[in-house]
Interface confidence: medium
């Protein structure tokens, strides 16, 4: 399962299968490589567990969004 | 406010078990991970491992495993740690914290509980 | 496991005058997100710690800008312009890069 997984990941082979809440989001990056069997979306945790997820699926999109804002609008 | 309020101290047997707990007001633990840590007196901090109390998901140290076990109660926003097989190596101050939005560049925070003691006597 | 090496292990500083406590890490903390989970807390005497700075160099809410923390890798500075009474107690550095979480030793700040 990739979302147990807490070293680098750099492919991902399976996606998780749940929604996490952007509370627990601290950052994503894609993965696009033509190496990987499929693209992807890791999202690293707020304590640092990095999760493979489905960039197709509105959640992922909608989490990738929020964190974007957040980027752009730092708290005072 | 945010705090979080532990359970008061506790002196055990040896080879006996503690459940400790750390009870949240200000916020609601399934949005966030809760974790502990243990410090022993005059030592520093050790991190025991953290709980996702929306779905009971827990990573422990690899020093902790089957020492300690984490749980939490969504309805009473309440998380535990037991302790088990209790040695002298156990007694210490555990506390719990939680933080959100660690690594953002949004901001951060992060909140300890009071600490419980637990000593162990033989 | 990562090792965190603090120094010195005891700092004695006069009121007023800056203070510099070093962390250096076994491995380095640049995660593959590009971003570097250091921190620095306090833990005041008698008291629970206190996270000060998270991300190498990001000041919690409440802390004093008297606080910088700075460094990249494995080599990690927090620095204390000038130094007050309520800085005294004992920082420790902590890792959230890699599994598990591990902290520093800690380094005790005294008041001369």
């Known amino acids: 399962q990739p979302d147990a997984i807490n070293a680098p990941v750099t492919c991902c082979y399976n996606f998780t299968n749940r929604k996490i809440s952007v509370q627990r989001l601290a950052s994503y990056r894609r993965i696009t490589s033509s190496k990987c069997p499929k693209e992807a979306v890791i999202f690293k945790t707020i304590v640092a567990k990095e999760i493979c997820a489905d960039p197709k699926q509105k959640w992922v999109q909608d989490s990738m969004d929020h964190l974007d804002k957040q980027i752009q609008t730092p708290k005072p | 406010e945010v705090q979080l309020q532990q359970s008061g101290a506790e002196l055990v047997r040896s080879g006996a078990s503690v459940k400790l707990s750390c009870t949240a007001s200000g916020f609601n633990i399934k949005d966030n991970y809760m974790h502990w840590v243990k410090q022993r007196p005059e030592q520093g901090l050790e991190w025991i491992g953290w709980i996702d109390p929306e779905n009971g998901d827990t990573e422990y140290a690899p020093k902790f495993q089957g020492k300690a076990t984490m749980t939490a109660d969504t309805s009473s926003n309440t998380a535990y740690l037991q302790l088990s097989s209790l040695t002298s190596e156990d007694t210490a101050v555990y506390y719990c914290?939680?933080?959100?939005?660690?690594?953002?560049?949004?901001?951060?925070?992060?909140?300890w509980g009071q600490g419980t003691t637990v000593t162990v006597s033989s | 496991d990562i090792q965190m090496t603090q120094t010195p292990l005891t700092l004695s500083v006069t009121i007023g005058q800056p203070a510099s406590i070093s962390c250096k890490s076994s491995q380095s903390l640049l995660d593959s997100d590009g971003k570097t989970y250091l921190n620095w807390s306090l833990q005041r005497p008698g008291q629970s710690p206190k996270r000060l700075i998270y991300l190498v160099s990001k000041l919690d809410s409440g802390v004093p800008d008297r606080f910088t923390g700075s460094g990249s890798g494995t080599d990690f500075t927090l620095k204390i312009s000038r130094v007050e009474a309520e800085d005294l107690g004992v920082y420790y550095c902590w890792q959230g890069t890699h599994f598990p979480q591990t902290f520093g030793g800690g380094t005790k700040l005294e008041i001369k």
């Open positions: 914290n939680t933080w959100a939005y660690y690594g953002t560049s949004y901001g951060g925070f992060a909140y």
